[in-house]
């Protein structure tokens, strides 16, 4: 076809200077020489479709997909990626070729896929297809451990499907409550996968590799403890193993334990019992309920009964998919400059979430604390009284959750001024957002009390760095005030601050700051 333009497709690799994620049509990075991607006409396709050679990119690498079109006249274009249209701005190089670029900064899995470029020239329409994939990378992971029964033995095996293969340890504690904290002397750690001593008060298995440490607690009902005010609840996903331990201590061996699901005895093979005498000659019995791979019909109330203790129950809920339940409505807070304050998010989630707090594009570690009612809470106190937008982000295998917070710090306005030949502007970031007054200083008004109302324009703008509001006021210069000193004042409920500006002809402008409480 004579009308077909000459097309060249190239890949430009950029050496990252720690650029942020995004797409644009300019690239302020060091670039390597372009690599020709061929761009051959695709046979047997409806319409004119050019296909570039497949592009494999390292994770976090930055690239530009570029098309050079040798066709007369103007061109217009449109990029399409995953059914979304992306902005396209063609320009012309020194050889008068049309140049269309797509910049991918810090490549991630979400940016991999097919990029379609639709080009319309005066002569014809055509499509160019780029396929971008991430280079085969192994993903090191750390997953929460789970339990399995050891074949033909009354023992638990702790498994964490992680790479590098983690160091597995059992964390055992025989005290109650606070004394079972990680570094307490009551805590014993055993660096092994199999645990035979299953009578302890608190049993956890932890797995650690260079990505961190993840722990799973053996869910326990203790018949000698007062039941919780709210029924304990255990969530599991279909296919996961279920383990519940029922524990009871009695003065002698004359008692037995049984498990029921919704008033029906558990089938044999779904429980096993162990017993031992404690140091004071009392008998400890434990009865495990376990299902190696749960299904929806394993949902329900699991009740442990004893002939010598009141029975206790736990609600086991089997879900198809993980979830994060929390209110995602944004919250605004207004605090004083030295007031102690923490953001907090209360949520219920399964599997356990990973979370981050973000402020001004910087991420902070996120700690979670379990509450008695099955909810968890994450608090963030490290805001250092910086106003702006704070983001809580949580995700697990199946769900994502984001919540926005705005922090406003009550403070007296601080005024900054700038001037040009035609106007003077004042800016302030005090909170609550200040109101403005402009005053003219003259022989008649040496204390600058003569108010200016003409030519004043006030606005508030979002300062992008912190998501914090800045108020500004601009005075358009008129002959009546040229050569005079003017004063702009910002005031709110906490005080007033002013700047004095000399409105002379263009040149350096002296500013006199004037703080009034």
């Amino acid at each position: 076809n004579q009308d077909l333009p000459v097309i060249k497709c190239v890949l430009i690799n950029h050496k990252n200077n720690d650029s942020s994620v995004g797409k644009s049509s300019s690239y302020p990075m060091v670039s390597e020489s372009p690599e020709d991607l061929g761009c051959a006409l695709r046979p047997q396709s409806s319409g004119t479709v050019y296909e570039a050679a497949a592009v494999e990119v390292d994770v976090s690498a930055s690239i530009t997909l570029q098309v050079l079109v040798d066709a007369p006249g103007n061109i217009s274009c449109l990029w399409v990626f995953k059914h979304s249209s992306l902005n396209c701005q063609p320009h012309f190089d020194l050889q008068n070729r049309g140049v269309v670029s797509m910049v991918i900064l810090k490549m991630t899995e979400t940016q991999a896929g097919e990029y379609l470029l639709f080009i319309q020239s005066e002569a014809t329409n055509y499509t160019i297809l780029f396929t971008v994939s991430i280079r085969n990378t192994l993903l090191y992971t750390l997953r929460r451990p789970y339990f399995r029964k050891m074949e033909n033995q009354d023992a638990l095996v702790c498994i964490s499907e992680s790479v590098p293969e983690p160091i597995v340890e059992w964390v055992l504690c025989d005290s109650q409550g606070e004394s079972c904290k990680e570094e307490s002397p009551a805590v014993v750690k055993k660096e092994e996968k199999v645990l035979h001593e299953l009578f302890g008060t608190d049993i956890r298995c932890c797995a650690r590799n260079e990505l961190g440490r993840e722990c799973t607690r053996l869910f326990t009902i203790d018949l000698n403890q007062t039941p919780q005010t709210t029924l304990p609840q255990l969530f599991l996903k279909v296919g996961e193993p279920l383990w519940i331990r029922c524990k009871a201590v009695h003065v002698n061996h004359g008692f037995g334990l049984t498990w029921e699901l919704e008033n029906k005895a558990l089938e044999e093979g779904n429980y096993f019992e162990m017993s031992t005498y404690s140091t004071n000659r009392t008998m400890i019995r434990i009865l495990f309920a376990f299902v190696s791979s749960v299904a929806r019909n394993d949902t329900g109330y699991y009740t442990c009964s004893s002939s010598k203790h009141p029975s206790q129950s736990a609600l086991v809920t089997i879900v198809e998919k993980g979830f994060i339940n929390a209110t995602n409505s944004s919250e605004d807070y207004e605090i004083d400059q030295y007031e102690e304050f923490c953001f907090s998010v209360r949520f219920k989630a399964y599997p356990q979430i990973r979370c981050t707090w973000t402020f001004s594009r910087k991420s902070f570690p996120c700690e979670q604390k379990g509450l008695d009612n099955g909810y968890s809470i994450s608090k963030f106190c490290n805001h250092k009284h910086q106003p702006g937008e704070y983001i809580f982000h949580a995700e697990n295998d199946d769900a994502q959750f984001t919540k926005m917070f705005t922090l406003n710090i009550r403070r007296k306005p601080q005024v900054l001024a700038e001037a040009s030949a035609s106007q003077a502007s004042c800016f302030s970031d005090g909170y609550p957002l200040p109101s403005w007054t402009w005053k003219k200083c003259s022989d008649k008004s040496p204390n600058c009390t003569e108010e200016i109302t003409e030519g004043v324009w006030n606005r508030k703008a979002n300062r992008k760095v912190f998501g914090q509001w800045v108020s500004s006021s601009t005075l358009n210069m008129s002959e009546a005030i040229k050569g005079f000193l003017v004063k702009c004042c910002a005031y709110n409920s906490l005080g007033t601050s002013c700047e004095t500006i000399l409105l002379n002809s263009p040149g350096p402008f002296p500013f006199i700051q004037d703080n009034i409480s």
Partner: antibody
Framework: QVQLVESGGGVVQPGRSLRLSCAAS????????MHWVRQAPGKGLEWVAV????????FYAESVKGRFTISRDNSKNTLYLQMNSLRAEDTAVYYC??????????????????????WGQGTTVTVSS | DIQMTQSPSSLSASVGDRVTITCRAS??????LNWYQQKPGKAPKLLIY???SLQSGVPSRFSGSGSGTEFTLTISSLQPEDFATYYC?????????FGGGTKVEIK
Amino acid sequence: QVQLVESGGGVVQPGRSLRLSCAASGFTFSSYGMHWVRQAPGKGLEWVAVISYEGSNEFYAESVKGRFTISRDNSKNTLYLQMNSLRAEDTAVYYCARGGEITMVRGVIGYYYYGMDVWGQGTTVTVSS
Amino acid sequence: DIQMTQSPSSLSASVGDRVTITCRASQSISSYLNWYQQKPGKAPKLLIYAASSLQSGVPSRFSGSGSGTEFTLTISSLQPEDFATYYCLQHNSYPLTFGGGTKVEIK
């Protein structure tokens, strides 16, 4: 460009201590796990230790466990190896190497891993009386 | 600990030869294996990661294969600059372990 530069090597008597440093540049240091690897004269490579991206998890070869400590200062883009109770068999060229890059995939924290893809030039430690 | 046994420990070959080096793990390491090249007085250089993926900037005459316990590094046509020592590394579990090395010398 991406670079690792080791320093702190030297001659030291058995039983004494030495601290090696590795200055990183050209990449986001705080997003990567970091390793120390050593090579005794005329011998093969031996992995020594690794530290996680934020510095809270360390793992060691059995031969150095309890004597060596790996640490990092992300604000200074620097990796360290504190070597105590040094022995003659610790004599080697010590290399620092970049490990995996942190990511989060469906709530599971992970490292993209190309292997130890960037190495320093090495610093020599000689333990001799 | 996982032992990595590399063979041969040394070999002599000529420019243009096809060279094969093997690495055997004492237990399965999936594809968590890398191959490195080291020249005298220099730091090791990553050639292959994930058992078979070619590191960026490495010539295509180098290739890796295998998974589980048996792995191979192949140089399809040996070039003068390829005379060096080659090491495999498993990073499936701690401690990470290197093979003993294979020295490729000029015949």
